[in-house]
């Protein structure tokens, strides 16, 4: 039993990491292999995790981890019963998924503004927590063409965009990702999308 | 937002004990390290003890043997058992949350060793 | 045990100079756990920067850490009211544990 591509492993900066590897072959993942891991700390201990299937010869793990800081590395190994099948390390920081925001609300109760808000996936002690931009990505549900993507550069888990900026008396789905850039993470992944019915008063032409 | 807040200091003669307690809030207690760090009066800080979220502990020399440091996850609680207490061990006593630093504390409790 | 050594002892400054506080160690140091507080009187310690170079959130710019090895430096560029204070640098060792310096306080002159 050999390891064919070692495990990467990406961190979502607050609990939980998740690391990924391919054997040789088709592998029982939870019954033959086991990852150990351990923050490099002095008051830290050892755990174990039970990987998952991840297609024949993929394997996963979601590692159990204490509140993420900068400096934090810690040592994985991949056992296989008794033996070592792998060895290495992994710096949650420098690998960074942040987690999907959530709660995506339309408000369209404002005139002929479209009010987005979602929650920041994070609590206010986590450092992501201000530090998290987002896309916002609006397509019609009629119209595979009509898509597009908001850039949210500030803050505020809020988007407004005039009504008319999209066609009138159709549906749209909208839905949010975030990323920070203080850490050079990746996307996370999109929030569920929620759906509206778009409309609002045509102005009067005027000749 | 974290809060901290110590109690259980007072007036305790040489050799007596004392059991401080500190309430925390605001953050996922849990996943965090928590440690004891005092201030003797009109002198700099100095690390007592810390413990990790699985239990492991550690502590400086000049308390070794004497206190004992522990946590309730249940009750968002740390606490620090202090026994064979000595004048020298009289400061502040500050709760702290952090890892490699220190970064929210508590505001304090004054733990007085004399006769 | 790594002993962590501030100077100078007291620092007399006017608002609106710039302040350089010196920590030295007896032995290299990580700048990863290297940490600056400030204490004022009768309030317990704040994290201003950590990493040797990170300042903590809510930390004001004109604070700002350097160094590596044995020698790290807290330079608050102009003064302000407020910074007159005692400042603490800290260290954490994988085997010895947490220790702080003895404190430089910064006086109004």
């Known amino acids: 039993m050999k390891v064919l591509q070692e495990p990467t492993c990406v961190s979502d900066y607050m609990s939980i990491s998740t690391c990924e590897w391919k054997m040789n072959g088709p592998t029982n993942c939870s019954t033959e292999l086991r990852l150990l891991y351990q923050l490099v700390f002095l008051l830290s201990e050892a755990h174990t995790c039970i990987p998952e299937n991840n297609g024949g010869a993929g394997c996963v793990c979601h590692l159990l981890m204490d509140d993420v800081v900068s400096a934090d590395n810690y040592t994985l190994d991949l056992w296989a019963g008794q033996q070592l099948l792998w060895k290495g390390s992994f710096k949650p920081s420098e690998h960074v998924k942040p987690r999907a925001p959530g709660n995506l609300t339309v408000h369209t109760n404002v005139s002929d503004t479209l009010l987005l808000t979602w929650s920041n996936p994070y609590p206010p002690d986590n450092y992501l927590y201000n530090h998290l931009t987002y896309a916002v990505n609006i397509w019609s549900e009629n119209d595979p063409a009509d898509f597009r993507i908001y850039n949210v550069t500030y803050l505020e888990p809020s988007l407004r965009i005039a009504a008319s900026t999209l066609k009138s008396g159709i549906s749209y789905r909208a839905r949010v990702r975030a990323w920070a850039q203080c850490y050079n993470t990746t996307w996370s992944e999109w929030s569920p999308s929620t759906k509206w019915h778009n409309s609002y008063r045509e102005p009067f032409e005027q000749h | 937002e974290v809060q901290l807040v110590e109690s259980g200091g007072g007036l305790v003669q040489p050799g007596g004990s004392l059991r401080l307690s500190c309430a925390a809030s605001?953050?996922?207690?849990?996943?965090?390290?928590m440690f004891w760090v005092r201030q003797a009066p009109g002198k700099g800080l100095e690390w007592v003890s810390g413990?990790?979220?699985?239990?492991?502990?550690s502590y400086a020399d000049s308390v070794k043997g004497r206190f004992t440091i522990s946590r309730d996850n249940a009750k968002n609680s740390l606490y620090l058992q202090m026994n064979s207490l000595r004048a020298e061990d009289t400061a502040v006593y500050y709760c702290?949350?952090?890892?490699?630093?220190?970064?929210?504390w508590g505001q304090g409790t004054l733990v007085t060793v004399s006769s | 045990e790594i002993v962590l050594t501030q100077s100078p002892g007291t620092l007399s400054l006017s608002p609106g100079e710039r302040a350089t506080l010196s920590c030295r160690a007896s032995?290299?140091?990580?700048?990863?756990?290297l940490a600056w507080y400030q204490q004022k009187p009768g309030q317990a310690p704040r994290l201003l920067i950590f990493?040797?170079?990170s300042r903590a959130p809510g930390i004001p710019d004109r604070f700002s850490g350097s160094g590596s090895g044995t020698d790290f430096t807290l330079t608050i560029s102009r003064l302000e009211p407020e910074d007159f204070a005692v400042y603490y640098c800290?260290?954490?060792?994988?085997?010895?544990?947490?220790?702080f310096g003895q404190g430089t306080k910064v006086e109004i002159k």
């Open positions: 990493g040797a170079s």
């Open positions: 800290q260290q954490y060792d994988h085997s010895a544990g947490w220790t």
């Open positions: 413990i990790g979220t699985g239990g492991a502990t």
């Open positions: 605001g953050f996922t207690f849990s996943r965090n390290a």
């Open positions: 032995q290299s140091v990580s700048n990863s756990y």
């Open positions: 702290a949350r952090g890892r490699y630093y220190f970064d929210y």
